[in-house]
Each structure stands twice: as C-alpha cells, then as structure tokens.
Amino acid sequence: CKAMHVAQPAVVLASSRGIASFVCEYASPGKATEVRVTVLRQADSQVTEVCAATYMMGNELTFLDDSICTGTSSGNQVNLTIQGLRAMDTGLYICKVELMYPPPYYLGIGNGTQIYVIDPEPCPDSDF
C-alpha cells in the first residue's frame, strides 16, 4: 500500500490581476465522504498555511470568509483559485489532501506548483 498520491501542475503563471488557478488531483484509496484540502506556501525552508477547507464529497468547498482562496470539487479533483497575489508572493504552493472520514485516515502531499506573479506595470499618464 502506497502513500496517497496528489498531483498538481509544476508551474502556473498568475494573471495580471494577481489570480492563479490550478487543479489538485488525488488518487483516493477509499470512498471518502469528508475531505480536507490545504494550500501551503513554501519559501526558503519555511512552510506556511495559505488556506484550508473541509468539504463533504459532492458539496462545495467552504473557505473562511476572508480567505484568499476559492475552489470547487469534482470527484477526486479540486480546482483551486488564489487571489490577491503580488510579485512577493511568488513561490511553491503545495496541495495537501486529507481523507478525514470515514476511517482510515489518508494524507497526501503534492510536490507543489510554482506560481509566478508579476506585478503589472503602472499605466503611463496619458493626455486623453
């Protein structure tokens, strides 16, 4: 029996509005009804939590009200969107998936998605 595999894209470029989206897919060894997804950011050797959501299979992901993350789920795929990103937020974003219920518990950690964020150039003043 192997660790639960979590797949995510290697690289994503955030939009000019600071929005990045990627898919986090997990190979579920069992029929989970309650799943927890956490997005972690690794910069240097530090890993910090970006956001987390627990959801019942078939239902929407619910992040905290002022979370910078939103997401939807479909089967064993979670579509994650991170908003409000700036150049300083460039880094490795790791998807962590936990099958919380029913037992047994499974934990899978992805290899991370490198998100590149480029701050837009300020618009030059125009005469119009």
């Epitope: 029996c1 192997k2 660790a3 956490t38 890993v47 956001c51 936990e98 047994p104 950690i109």
Partner: antibody, heavy 117, light 108 residues
Framework: DVKLVESGGGLVKLGGSLKLSCAAS????????MSWVRQTPEKRLELVAA????????YYPDTVKGRFTISRDNAKNTLYLQMSSLKSEDSALYYC??????????WGQGTTLTVSS | ENVLTQSPAIMSASPGERVTMTCSAS?????MHWYQQKSNTSPKLWIY???KLASGVPGRFSGSGSRNSYSLTISSMEAEDVATYYC???????????FGGGTKLEIK
Amino acid sequence: DVKLVESGGGLVKLGGSLKLSCAASGFTFNIYYMSWVRQTPEKRLELVAAINPDGGNTYYPDTVKGRFTISRDNAKNTLYLQMSSLKSEDSALYYCARYGGPGFDSWGQGTTLTVSS
Amino acid sequence: ENVLTQSPAIMSASPGERVTMTCSASSSVSYMHWYQQKSNTSPKLWIYDTSKLASGVPGRFSGSGSRNSYSLTISSMEAEDVATYYCFPGSGFPFMYTFGGGTKLEIK
C-alpha cells in the same frame, strides 16, 4: 485497539549512537504517516522525525537533521529512529506517535534516552 | 517557523471554577488541536479541529478560536483535569511545526 510500543532507549555516551524501535499493532500501519516526538526534562514536546506511509519521504527539524534517520518496515509493522552524534540536549523521553486525521491520535508509552559525558 | 505560545505557563483553579488557557500562533492556521498529558503518562489527543472533543473527553471541555488565537476552556474545574495541556496546529504542514510550551493546570 491501536498499540504502539517503543524500545531501545538507554544510557549513551556523548557522540554515541542508538537505534529506537516502535512496534505497531491494531491498525493498518502502511497507510499512516508516523513520527517520533520527544519530551525534554523540562517537559517540552518536540517533533524530531516523521515519515510517509511508504517510507519515501522523511522530515526532520534542523536540530536533528543529519544526525537522526527515521525509517520503517511495513512488513514488520515497525518504525525506527537511528540516532548518531548524540548530544546532551538529545536526552529525553522518546514517543512513537501515529499521525491520524486529528493530529497525533495515538502515542506509545515512550522510551528514555540519556546522553552522558 | 510557526511558533506557538501558550499562556499562562502554570495556573491553578479551585474545583468548580471556570478555566481558560490560550495558544497564540505566529502564523495563521485554520485549525488547532489540544493534547492532555497527566503526570507520568503519554499525551492524549483531547480536542481536535479547534472545537471537537476526542472520544471520552468530558463535555465540560470546549475549544474555540481562529487564525492566530485559540483557547481551551473548562467550564467547571475538577480534580481529574489536573494535567499539562499542549496545543499543536491541525492544519498547515504538520511535520514542520513545534508544540506549544504547554499550560500546567493545578488544583487549589
């Protein structure tokens, strides 16, 4: 019932080595992340090593990196901690702990390491 | 490193008294777990996912909080609650965290 039984602790000289074992039973060992947590004489709890279910990924804090090696034998349902270049500050009670849905949900009774000069 | 600071380090309460201890995280986390450790025994998971009681935990215990600040409350102190309580993040990357320093609860 989940059962974790540590063994291998003892008195070791400064700079010496020791290997701890943890025999697991009562659950499907090969699907869980496992860890070693130590409790210092001052009663602080410190996570010193963790390993994923198939043994392919290991995690250590900087305090023990390069000196401690965690491993597992899923066929024997056993977790190990190889410790070398031991320091006085490594003296502690070492617990084997299972990382389940709600954090470290099962703990062994602990085995004591004393590093003497 | 996400540092967890528990306060107070030591406290004592009379039987029947309400007890609250806190755990502050230097970085935001979505959930917090609490462990109880009685003298000469192993730690036990006591409260998980911030507010859920582990199996066998009396209903006088409760947990609350969010982001950087969490707390454990005992509505009415009893002698069997004498122990040290440790917090540990329930989300984020578990194997890069340290436990809180603990709150030792004594009875008056």
